[in-house]
Amino acid sequence: QQQTLPKPFIWAEPHFMVPKEKQVTICCQGNYGAVEYQLHFEGSLFAVDRPKPPERINKVKFYIPDMNSRMAGQYSCIYRVGELWSEPSNLLDLVVTEMYDTPTLSVHPGPEVISGEKVTFYCRLDTATSMFLLLKEGRSSHVQRGYGKVQAEFPLGPVTTAHRGTYRCFGSYNNHAWSFPSEPVKLLVTGDIENTSLAPEDPTFPADTWGTYLLTTETGLQKDHALWDHTAQNLLR
């Protein structure tokens, strides 16, 4: 006899990184026939939705019109069919960005390097933070943590053409409150094309992550996105 229903999926639209005072929608997808969904935030009940008619709806949306640091944190959802509750969803880490200041991102020896050269990014923020995050745009995105009083080093080691791309960094005041993003730094790597097929792939974010985030930042527009795996958020745990 089944004691619980399968866990629902949870995600944020347009993005789990939400600029301060912008809007975000938290989506929870369970099963057709669910009579109630509950959204929990940091262990406490945050919101409830009772879809009508339940047999025709398998997803609910909770709108947050005005993101702030009080709402940044870990969310999960559950749903109920009759008297039977589901397992809780995976955790969704909702991050508020554009807090306080803007870090400076630089790269050594420079933005144009040859394949095999050692490259280090430096993210600097003079306000009180000790954790920094380096993000690379695109499908093959890497998210790295770094630590330092005002500056963190991100050594990429000997680079390949797979490291080509646009990088930004954030200062992190806590796991769920980040600074403004730095200005982008574009890394150009010239080298042997044969090496690219052997380059390590790390699909941490979907291809349009930064496009979506920047859309949120600049216009606050809502945009429906396909469900995607939030393994990227493991960096927060």
Epitope: L45, V60, P65
Partner: nanobody, 126 residues
């Protein structure tokens, strides 16, 4: 900008009733989810009841069966009908709104609300 003004508070005996009103300014009331919270002296603000745009409701266990939340979109007003009042219901009662939101969402956590009233005092004593 939404402004919320509570009224209807006062002193009542245990077992008595009161009806609180919260009048909202602006044309956005129909797109708002509404809630009532309360704060007793020396305690944290706590959830009491909430109502969605589509009139779904949710109550704190401590008031279930005694309090009823309702809304009148034509009057831009949300109500809290309180009956069988107890001494532990003594508190300042605050009205709050989430604007805008989806139709059937009911918000329970105070962090979700982006507009708040100034509060009205309810005192229950013999």
């Amino acid at each position: 900008e939404v402004q919320l003004v509570e009224s209807g508070g006062g002193e009542v005996q245990p077992g008595g009733s009161l009806r609180l009103s919260c009048a909202a300014s602006g044309r956005t009331f129909a797109s708002a989810a509404m809630g009532w919270f309360r704060q007793a002296p020396g305690k944290e603000r706590e959830f009491v009841a909430a109502i969605s745009r589509s009139d779904d409701t949710y109550y704190a266990e401590s008031v279930k069966g005694r309090f009823t939340i309702s809304r009148d979109n034509a009057k831009n007003t949300v109500y809290l009908q309180m009956s069988s009042l107890r001494a532990e219901d003594t508190a300042v009662y605050y009205c709050a709104a989430v604007v805008p939101t989806y139709g059937s969402s009911i918000y329970v956590h105070s962090a979700a609300y982006n507009y708040w009233g100034q509060g009205t005092l309810v005192t229950v004593k013999p």
